[in-house]
């Protein structure tokens, strides 16, 4: 799991405990069983913008 207090990974990336850093989800094409790919698969689509306050 990501260390407490660290910034979340940016959009399109996911935390890798194996590498101890955020990884670009595009890397899952090379190695789909990498630990961070689970987070990429589970990542929701881009949040929609609310049209009301």
């Amino acid at each position: 799991e990501q260390a407490p207090g660290t910034a979340p990974c940016s959009r399109g990336s996911s935390w890798s405990a194996d590498l101890d850093k955020c990884m670009d989800c595009a890397s899952c094409r090379a190695r789909p069983h990498s630990d961070f790919c689970l987070g990429c698969a589970a990542a929701p689509p881009a949040p929609f913008r609310l049209l009301w306050p």
């Epitope: 405990a17 194996d18 590498l19 101890d20 990884m23 670009d24 595009a26 890397s27 899952c28 094409r29 090379a30 190695r31 789909p32 069983h33 990498s34």
Partner: antibody, heavy 120, light 112 residues
Framework: QVQLVQSGAEVKKPGASVKVSCKAS????????IAWVKQAPGQGLEWIGE????????YYSEKFRGKATLTADTSTSTAYMELSSLRSEDTAVYFC?????????????WGQGTLVTVSS | DIVMTQSPLSLPVTPGEPASISCRSS???????????LYWYLQKPGQSPQLLIY???NRASGVPDRFSGSGSGTDFTLKISRVEAEDVGVYYC?????????FGQGTKVEIK
């Protein structure tokens, strides 16, 4: 250029241990996986396990769990594989290989291999 | 574990002629992302394995275009359009879908 240079051939007695090294150069050692592969005489390739050098996290084949121990020293960019309780069936050439985790291309680089002979 | 099975295990070839090696996996190597995680390696005599083909059909850097990979799911083929003397060695298929990383038994290609 990327290079993996392994330690020299070893002859060991049954029951002994051996530690094989794999020195990496030409890239950032902590950014890639180092895998270890066994090739017994006249046989095929068998994955032993792999290590993430930056964190020391390891994954092992069930067959080699307890037989092989993988470590890495980031200060010297060197990966190690120790084999314990050696038996005649451990006689083989052992390869280290750099495996990518980036983008599409699985551009493996392999060491030259280390022959371990177990003989009384 | 995914079991990789190659055929033939021995392949005598004539320089200039085509050659073909088959590989079958015990489960599909086609990921939901559309990629087949099948790889081909060549181990020349006295050398380390070298990557020829990655993700079923992509040639690795420096690999001549006489080598090609095809297939899908569980059945794959490596083709050499015109065999050259330097192509002798043992060819292995392998997968990269999950751990453990497993290889076929190898196909020994030798000149007739």
């Amino acid at each position: 250029q990327v290079q993996l240079v392994q330690s020299g051939a070893e002859v060991k007695k049954p029951g002994a241990s051996v530690k094989v090294s794999c020195k990496a150069s030409g890239y950032t050692f902590t950014d890639f996986i180092i895998a270890w592969v066994k090739q017994a005489p006249g046989q095929g390739l068998e994955w032993i396990g792999e290590i993430y050098p930056g964190t020391g996290r390891t994954y092992y084949s069930e067959k080699f769990r307890g037989k092989a121990t993988l470590t890495a020293d980031t200060s010297t960019s060197t990966a190690y594989m120790e084999l314990s309780s050696l038996r005649s069936e451990d006689t083989a050439v052992y390869f280290c290989a750099r495996r990518t985790i980036y983008y599409d291309y699985d551009g493996d680089y392999w060491g030259q291999g280390t022959l371990v002979t177990v003989s009384s | 574990d995914i079991v990789m099975t190659q055929s033939p295990l021995s392949l005598p070839v004539t320089p200039g002629e085509p050659a073909s090696i088959s590989c079958r996996s015990s489960q599909s190597l086609l990921h939901s992302n559309g990629i087949n995680y099948l790889y081909w390696y060549l181990q020349k005599p006295g050398q380390s394995p070298q990557l020829l083909i990655y993700q079923m059909s992509n040639r690795a850097s420096g690999v001549p275009d006489r080598f090609s990979g095809s297939g899908s799911g569980t059945d794959f083929t490596l083709k050499i359009s015109r065999v050259e003397a330097e192509d002798v060695g043992v060819y292995y298929c392998a997968h990269n879908l999950e751990l453990p990383w497993t290889f076929g038994q190898g196909t020994k290609v030798e000149i007739k």
